[in-house]
């Protein structure tokens, strides 16, 4: 008889999850010489150990500490790019501007990007049928706790001028409930971070409003101020031109505003 399995509201673990994580790890360590020392089998074991056999609504940041330790990586000062609700453009940017890094350009973020996973209490099985949904089931699920843990660490280790890309098309350009708004912004360390510079990405071609005056940006400025960190904001009116100018800064059209 098949065992009874908890039904969650979210989609199940991504198919071939162990193989995907291992393959991504191998690929990453081959491409990044500074991470060649990393043993990918140990990384997978630590990843697995964080959620296998554990009730998937009772995962803690502590569960991920062995993995975090193995994936320790530093970003040079002034080279951290955070993002909120605009992942694709942030990643397109760091693919061109190779000396800047999002969390997903780091080993742990790269391993887990776009994947879902969970286990079951007291069994060594991975649940491919369903996993807890953050809203409908619980917030302390394997995926959410993972991103909270690595996002906190990514923000804590940032230094110099930190940049964040925000989606100007959303009703809340800065959302206190996003990972950036609830975790990263509160873990920037004033001893190391001189300033946060927000890039507000405009959606419409004819949108000439100054979105840096948006009330939610004032909320972000307030939080950053309370942390004794300077705040700057820039409108990126033409994201397509912005990327083009990152690729070809000498282009004559890039000397005017973006």
């Amino acid at each position: 008889l098949p065992r009874w399995r908890q039904q969650w509201s979210g989609s199940g673990t991504t198919s071939r999850f162990p193989e995907t994580v291992l393959a991504r790890c191998v690929k990453y360590t081959e491409v990044h010489p500074e991470m060649r020392h990393v043993d990918c089998q140990s990384v997978w074991d630590a990843f697995k150990g964080a959620f296998i056999s554990k009730y998937p609504c009772n995962i803690t940041e502590e569960d991920y500490q062995p993995l975090v330790k193995l994936g320790t990586q530093t970003v040079p000062c002034n080279k951290t790019l955070l993002w909120s609700r605009i992942k694709d453009l942030a990643h397109q940017f760091t693919q061109v501007q190779r000396d800047m890094f999002t969390l997903e350009d780091m080993l742990l973020g790269y391993l887990a990007d776009d994947l879902t996973w969970c286990g079951e209490f007291n069994t060594f099985e991975i649940n491919y049928q369903s996993c807890p949904d953050w809203r409908k089931d619980c917030s302390n699920n394997p995926v959410s706790v993972f991103w909270k843990t690595v996002s906190r660490r990514f923000a804590e280790t940032a230094c110099g001028v930190v940049h964040v890309m925000l989606n100007g098309s959303r009703s809340k350009i800065f959302d206190k409930n996003s990972t950036f708004g609830s975790v990263e912004v509160h873990n920037l360390q004033p001893e190391k971070v001189q300033a946060l510079e927000a890039w507000v990405i405009h959606g419409g071609r004819e949108d000439s409003r100054d979105l840096c005056q948006d009330p939610t940006i004032k909320e972000l400025e307030s939080i950053i101020s309370k942390r004794n960190i300077r705040f700057f904001c820039k409108n990126i009116y033409r994201p397509d031109k912005f990327l083009q100018c990152v690729k070809n800064p000498e282009d004559s059209s890039c000397l005017s505003g973006i």
């Epitope: 609830s182 004033p190 001189q194 400025e221 307030s222 309370k226 004794n228």
Partner: antibody
């Protein structure tokens, strides 16, 4: 223990300049921003702005742009408020207050305040 | 900027009574409201900070509630030492703004 100690009362004539000090002790001065708050006689509190104690960068509320200047002496863990070209309406008590943030949670608070410096402007 | 309206402006209460002060904000400030007590000749003292958090050392008879635009500060069992001015301060967005204050006296 944490303390913010401000300089003593000032009696000035219109057009003169005053500089108020706020000396911090009991914590790492450069870790926390410093606010300045005005309280005119019989009136409520008005937030004037804040000073980044790492960089010395001031941020002023609209009403306090121009004649008001925040500055810093990091080695002495001291913040300053200077008011130029004093007017009668500058007569008030001025408070410094630090912005605290919790390291283990997202808690923020203007928690410790100086005792206040009374500035009287009268011809 | 966010306008903070505080009422009542003054309050006369008997010892032992329950005190209630209210602040309304012109914009949604989540729960970023702070409550201060200011006794004559003293600086403001923080009683409750963002998230309706009672500060260490502040008696548990003080409490606050509210989210968005409507906030209430209460304390049970008024004592003579509670005679003071009370202010609410929103710290959601710059510039930070303060309510007009409530003067509390003994009846």
């Amino acid at each position: 223990q944490i303390q913010l100690v401000q300089s003593g009362p000032e009696l000035k004539k219109p057009g003169e300049t005053v500089k108020i000090s706020c000396k911090a002790s009991g914590y790492t001065f450069t870790n926390y921003g410093m606010n300045w708050v005005k309280q005119a006689p019989g009136e409520d509190l008005k937030w004037m702005g804040w000073l980044n104690t790492n960089t010395g960068e001031p941020t002023y509320a609209e009403e306090f742009k121009g004649r008001f200047a925040f500055s810093l002496e990091t080695s002495a863990s001291t913040a300053y408020l200077q008011i130029n070209n004093l007017r009668n309406e500058d007569t008030a008590t001025y408070f410094c207050a630090r912005w605290y943030y919790g390291s283990s949670d997202n808690s923020y608070a203007m928690d410790y305040w100086g005792q206040g410096t009374s500035v009287t402007v009268s011809s | 900027e966010t306008i903070v309206t505080q009422f009542p402006a003054s309050l006369s209460m008997a010892i032992g009574e329950k005190v209630t002060i209210r602040c309304i904000t012109s914009t949604d400030i989540d729960d970023d409201m702070n409550w201060y007590q200011q006794r004559p000749g003293e600086p403001p003292k923080l009683l409750i900070s963002e998230g309706n958090t009672l500060r260490p050392g502040v008696p548990s008879r003080f409490s606050s509630s509210g989210y968005g635009t409507d906030f209430v500060f209460t304390f049970e069992n008024m004592l003579s030492e509670d005679v003071a001015d009370y202010y609410c301060l929103q710290s959601d967005s710059l510039p930070y703004t303060v309510g007009g204050g409530t003067r509390l006296e003994i009846k």
